[in-house]
């Protein structure tokens, strides 16, 4: 999906009322010194791109996330403010569903969480301009 | 817990340069962005720069164009704001603030240097 | 750059009173402001980010809201601590310019 044409600050302004606080709530008992952030972005479509990736595809050690409220929240977000994102995401649905897991929050997932909230992070922050 | 640890105060002669360290504590010291605000006596606050500690890239106010250099050392987890051609009208509280979780807003600052500038 | 305007640059009030401060940008900047308070000597302390979202740990007698270019910070009822200086700062584009600032003052 392309996510050049999704409304930013809409998803932002989600992100920061809602999303935001339900990673929190999932990272909490974390020190904020434990991860660095290795995972980047250079631009919002690409920002959402990683986000998107990260969030909702398994990998090696953490194959839960899809199922946490900031996920559910995101895309959520991403279909209401994204222009033809729904469409796009219905035979990943159905895989995922096939798949469901039992929710176990591994060191991995954490890791995970914590890159996300980098990703977020860089996505939100203002236009930096060089003067 | 998060902590923003600035120099002490300054006193300077107009035309010199003078260099304020902002010691950060607490969180991951490269995955966040360091902003520099100045505030004269009795006025308001003025947005001097950024700087992104993990590459070194920078964004500075027209303003201090070409006067001022933000730096960072990952080593120490310390930041660095040096203002040259020092004039009476920078004499002011100089603080360091840290990026929020969100990258929305500042939420830690530092507790700022007293910098004088007189002949 | 975008300019932020507040207003009053100042006002008095008495404790329990409601009051309202206002900021407006010179350009559309969306939901992305910030509001702090600052007490004489110190360093200032978030309250409000992305124009309505309470930092934790700030008391719920404070609220933002607006977008676009008009905002607001509202405090329900003044409390003897919440007599400071507040500014805005928008969180658009560099430079991320502040307010003018309004010295809350104890009538």
């Known amino acids: 999906y392309d996510f050049t044409n999704c409304d930013f600050e809409k998803i932002k302004a989600a992100y920061l009322s809602t999303i935001s606080k339900d990673l929190i709530t999932y990272m909490s008992g974390t020190k904020s010194t434990e991860f660095n952030n290795t995972v980047s972005c250079s631009n919002r479509p690409h920002c959402l791109t990683e986000i998107q990736s990260l969030t909702f595809n398994p990998t090696a050690g953490c194959a839960s996330l899809a199922k946490e409220m900031f996920a559910m929240k995101t895309k959520a977000a991403l279909a209401i403010w994204c222009p033809g994102y729904s469409e796009t995401q219905i035979n990943a649905t159905q895989a995922m569903k096939k798949r469901r897991k039992r929710k176990v929050t591994t060191n991995k997932c954490l890791e995970q969480v914590s890159q996300l909230q980098g990703l977020w992070r860089r996505f939100n922050r203002p236009l930096l301009k060089q003067q | 817990q998060v902590q923003l640890v600035q120099s002490g105060a300054e006193v300077k002669k107009p035309g010199a340069s003078v260099k304020v360290s902002c010691k950060a504590s607490g969180y991951a010291f490269t995955n966040y962005l360091i902003e520099w605000v100045r505030q004269a006596p009795g006025q308001g606050l003025e947005w001097m720069g950024i700087i992104n500690p993990e590459s070194g890239d920078t964004y500075y106010a027209q303003k201090f164009q070409g006067r001022v250099t933000l730096t960072a050392d990952k080593s120490t987890s310390t930041a660095y704001m040096e203002l040259s051609s020092l004039r009476s009208e920078d004499s002011a509280v100089y603080y360091c603030a840290k990026e929020s979780l969100t990258g929305s807003s500042y939420d830690y600052w530092g507790q700022g240097t007293t910098l004088t500038v007189s002949s | 750059d975008i300019q932020m305007t507040q207003s009053p640059s100042s006002l008095s009030a008495s404790v329990g009173d409601r009051v309202t401060i206002t900021c407006r940008a010179s350009?559309?900047?969306?939901?992305?402001l910030v509001w702090y308070q600052q007490k004489p000597g110190k360093a200032p302390q978030l309250l409000v980010y992305g124009a309505r979202n309470l930092q934790s740990g700030v008391p719920s007698r404070f609220s933002g809201s607006g977008s676009g270019t008009q905002f607001s910070l509202t405090i329900s009822s003044l409390q003897p601590e919440d007599f400071a200086t507040y500014y805005c700062?928008?969180?658009?584009?560099?430079?991320?310019?502040f307010g003018t600032g309004t010295k809350l003052e104890i009538k």
């Open positions: 350009e559309n900047i969306y939901s992305n």
């Open positions: 700062q928008h969180f658009y584009e560099t430079p991320l310019t």
